[in-house]
Interface confidence: low
């Protein structure tokens, strides 16, 4: 594949990454799949600067990110180490709350209306953010 050197149309560039901000809602798994089909992944927040950038663009709206604990420990979808990485949970979160009556706990992380993170039921139809890194190999065939 070719190296991507600029962001696709309707994506926003920031610090050598490209971001796409949805304006509709999907369950976490559907949002995850959407990003993958775009040769991207749900956003992985690795710094305070990236947190502020994303927060600025999404506004006060619940929005999925690429962090989940559906298989036990919390994991970022791109393999970034969770334990040593940046975190911005709300106080007392994540709490894997079972009291919502929807079955199971809360396994997917989202930005809340104030930007801090919360874990929630993965089936909720929240907005989402896709991210892809510039300079990584694209799956598209090179232009001849």
């Amino acid at each position: 594949g070719s190296e991507r050197t600029c962001c696709p149309v309707n994506w926003v560039e920031h610090e050598r990454s490209c971001y796409w901000f949805s304006r509709s809602g999907k369950a976490w798994a559907d949002a995850d799949n959407y990003c993958r089909l775009e040769d991207a992944h749900l956003v992985v927040v690795t710094s305070w600067e990236e947190q502020k950038f994303v927060q600025h663009h999404i506004g006060p709206v619940n929005t999925w990110m690429g962090l989940h604990d559906q298989n036990g420990p919390w994991k970022w979808v791109d393999g970034t180490d969770y334990e040593t990485g940046f975190k911005n949970w709300r106080p007392e979160q994540p709490d894997d709350w079972y009291g919502h009556g929807l079955g199971g706990g809360e396994d997917c992380a989202h930005f809340t209306d104030d930007g801090r993170w919360n874990d929630d039921v993965c089936q909720r139809p929240y907005r989402w953010v896709c991210e892809t890194e510039l300079d990584k190999a694209s799956q598209e065939p090179p232009l001849l």
């Epitope: 305070w48 502020k52 927060q55 600025h56 006060p60 975190k87 949970w89 106080p91 007392e92 209306d113 104030d114 930007g115």
Partner: antibody, heavy 117, light 108 residues
Framework: QVQLQQWGAGLLKPSETLSLTCAVF????????WSWIRQPPGKGLEWIGE???????NYNPSLKSRVTMSVDTSKKQFSLKLSSVTAADTAVYYC???????????WGQGTMVTVSS | EIVLTQSPGTLSLSPGERATLSCRAS???????LAWYQQKPGQAPRLLIY???RRATGIPDRFSGSGSGTDFTLTISRLEPEDFAVYYC?????????FGQGTKLEIK
């Protein structure tokens, strides 16, 4: 360089309402929580509460019934009101920015508020 | 509410010595949302350490933080004259945010 400048009445009578304002200079106002913290003379620090630029608030339960925080994003200012003050509310009041890992990374200069009849 | 207990209340040391300040929480401080501040008379507190072990901007590397769960430590490897002050720990792993009562570091 982000700086916080605060002001408000320094001398109050019991039962009056304390009112302080904090202005943010040289940096972003949105994307942060803004907090109020107080320190009685010779004592430790007590968190009063915080607010986000969208208007979300989070107060210390011990003061919640008397506290109101508000924000004016156009002026990059946030304010504290504490009603029905008593001598126990005498303290230096600080505004502060809630930064990375929920730590207070930038502080105002402090305002000494004395409640006395 | 998480209660933070700092010890010792007062620590008397000489410049050049090593200072070890302790902060113990009544419950786990989730994700190490614990910070350390220095305060000098008549001044606002200054952030030294956040996230239990990350030095704030402009803080000399003689200051270091460690710990997790309920036990946290601030270490000043080699005391300078300007380090004598009151030090506070603070947690926000659980609401409400709370501070320790402070440790006064004085010149011996």
């Amino acid at each position: 360089q982000v700086q916080l400048q605060q002001w408000g009445a320094g001398l109050l009578k019991p039962s009056e309402t304390l009112s302080l304002t904090c202005a943010v200079f040289g940096g972003s106002f949105s994307g942060h929580y803004w907090s109020w913290i107080r320190q009685p003379p010779g004592k430790g620090l007590e968190w009063i509460g915080e607010m986000y630029h969208f208007g979300n608030t989070n107060y210390n339960p011990s003061l919640k019934s008397r506290v109101t925080m508000s924000v004016d994003t156009s002026k990059k200012q946030f304010s504290l009101k504490l009603s029905s003050v008593t001598a126990a509310d005498t303290a230096v009041y600080y505004c502060a920015r809630v930064g990375q890992w929920l730590a207070f990374d930038i502080w105002g200069q402090g305002t000494m508020v004395t409640v006395s009849s | 509410e998480i209660v933070l207990t700092q010890s010792p209340g007062t620590l008397s040391l000489s410049p050049g010595e090593r200072a070890t300040l302790s902060c113990r929480a009544s419950q786990n401080v989730s994700y190490s949302y614990l910070a350390w501040y220095q305060q000098k008379p008549g001044q606002a507190p200054r952030l030294l350490i956040y996230g239990a072990s990350r030095r704030a901007t402009g803080i000399p590397d003689r200051f270091s933080g460690s710990g997790s769960g309920t036990d946290f430590t601030l270490t000043i490897s080699r005391l300078e004259p300007e380090d004598f002050a009151v030090y506070y720990c603070q947690q926000y792993g659980s609401s409400p945010c709370s501070f320790g009562q402070g440790t006064k570091l004085e010149i011996k």
